[in-house]
Interface confidence: low
Amino acid sequence: SERCDDWGLDTMRQIQVFEDEPARIKCPLFEHFLKFNYSTAHSAGLTLIWYWTRQDRDLEEPINFRLPENRISKEKDVLWFRPTLLNDTGNYTCMLRNTTYCSKVAFPLEVVQKDSCFNSPMKLPVHKLYIEYGIQRITCPNVDGYFPSSVKPTITWYMGCYKIQNFNNVIPEGMNLSFLIAFISNNGNYTCVVTYPENGRTFHLTRTLTVKVVGSPKNAVPPVIHSPNDHVVYEKEPGEELLIPCTVYFSFLMDSRNEVWWTIDGKKPDDIPIDVTINESISHSRTEDETRTQILSIKKVTSEDLKRSYVCHARSAKGEVAKAATVKQKVPAPRYTVELACGFGAT
């Protein structure tokens, strides 16, 4: 019970695995917390010990490595389940120690059930494909290390519940699923089921990911400011509310940061001594093109405010654009008794 460097519960590694399938889980110590790898630790005489805490319990207990058919085993820095059971769900701890050193980290493992159409509470990775962009592929994820290269697995791909066979533009090619040309209709969940033999038993690995067809870089353009534009004049009397929307269209660009901002007289609104509020809304098209609207609002506009320059700016990886709003002070309507009558030469 000597002191141990405890990295706590690593919730960033929310590991989910399917029931009745193999799972191999690497001790996170060597991946995220320590500056040396397992081999170095092992050579230095450190021992890796595994514990677990069952779901809804608070008692850390050793893992039983003497189950029939070695259902749970450890190999170097990997904890193996062949296969998992629903009640394996819990928090797992790996501890590296010798007589003078100790370091440990815990992580949650959730064993989830799936139905015959692969629906489950599993969080799915999203893979984006460019629309009508030519051949693209997705790869069956997280299957490395489950079987040696000498073993030839069988891989079956599904879209939703349906086996991908003779699909027009989607071709299973081993661990890869090739989209000869991607359309919106290809949006959906794709599952690969990898079947392989091991010691006279057959195991299945199920991996599902979500495919989202997005705008192609071929069609990407710099931001387009729809509003303000030259056709709309914001004419206000002092004391009225001034509302100017800045509406910008952004083509989808992978990993691009889309930005919209207002300047007033060349400064950020925060740097101007007036009561300005800016509200933003965002909408997306089916291909994840984005429309951002920022509404600049001055509750009670002054004649001074109506002389200022209001410019909407937008920026993406494709470029930067800006557009000024046309803001004017409304000329008061003439009062008949004085101005209008005089205009008609009345005395």
């Epitope: 592929r137 000498s150 069988t154 791909w157 533009n169 071709i171 090619e173 081993g174 661990m175 000869l180």
Partner: antibody, heavy 121, light 107 residues
Framework: EVQLVQSGAEVKKPGESLKISCKGS????????IGWVRQMPGKGLEWMGI????????RYSPSFQGQVTISADKSISTAYLQWSSLKASDTAMYYC??????????????WGQGTLVTVSS | EIVLTQSPGTLSLSPGERATLSCRAS??????LNWYQQKPGKAPKLLIY???SLQSGVPSRFSGSGSGTDFTLTINSLQPEDFATYYC?????????FGQGTKVEIK
């Protein structure tokens, strides 16, 4: 027994058009791609393109795009390769091959016997 | 497109010897590589698919190995009927491409 039987040898003049055929039998013709491969005299194999007879979806190698047209008539289990205007450089042996895109691999598992096209003035 | 480079261009061996043919891809193609044998005046014949799987009816003296970018076709104890040209072909992405071929000739 899976078989791909190609049409006979052709001798043509430059500028003429040509359509050669590849008839599949012994398997579900609409369930497999048919690829076309060129082999110029004394040279290696070049992939030209591929067609999915079920809906005639085609893919061409960039080198052959616009130079040839691949088509299929699923009612008679036949794929075609055609030229609108032949050139002397089109002289070659042309093979059709079935592309077996199974669950975990893709290959050209059955080949036609080849059609020799000679273009000479 | 993916370029496949085969080496050597020609391999001169005697019957009974072992032939080792190499195929290198310009980028990783996983295991999506096939090997074909072609004899003069004949259509190519599939020998190995998915880098290492033996096509039905092909003698077991033929074997394939490799993954990623480097692949090998090995013919143990060459028989007289094995003297031919061998092509590798990738099915990883369109356009499908072939290597330029390795001719195995009698020494």
């Amino acid at each position: 027994e899976v078989q791909l039987v190609q049409s006979g040898a052709e001798v043509k003049k430059p500028g003429e058009s040509l359509k050669i055929s590849c008839k599949g039998s012994g398997y579900s013709f609409t369930s497999y791609w048919i690829g076309w491969v060129r082999q110029m005299p004394g040279k290696g194999l070049e992939w030209m393109g591929i067609i999915y007879p079920s809906d005639s979806y085609t893919r061409y190698s960039p080198s052959f795009q616009g130079q040839v047209t691949i088509s299929a008539d699923k009612s008679i289990s036949t794929a075609y390769l055609q030229w609108s205007s032949l050139k002397a450089s089109d002289t070659a042996m042309y093979y059709c091959a079935r592309r077996n895109s199974a669950e975990n691999y893709a290959d050209l598992d059955y080949w036609g016997q080849g059609t020799l096209v000679t273009v000479s003035s | 497109e993916i370029v496949l480079t085969q080496s050597p261009g020609t391999l001169s061996l005697s019957p009974g010897e072992r032939a080792t043919l190499s195929c290198r891809a310009s980028q990783s193609i996983s295991n999506d590589l096939n090997w074909y044998q072609q004899k003069p005046g004949k259509a190519p014949k599939l020998l190995i698919y998915y880098a290492s799987s033996l096509q039905s009816g092909v003698p077991s003296r033929f074997s394939g190995s490799g993954s990623g970018t480097d692949f090998t076709l090995t013919i143990n104890s060459l028989q007289p009927e094995d003297f031919a040209t061998y092509y590798c072909q990738q099915s990883f992405t369109a356009p499908l491409t072939f290597g330029q071929g390795t001719k195995v000739e009698i020494k």
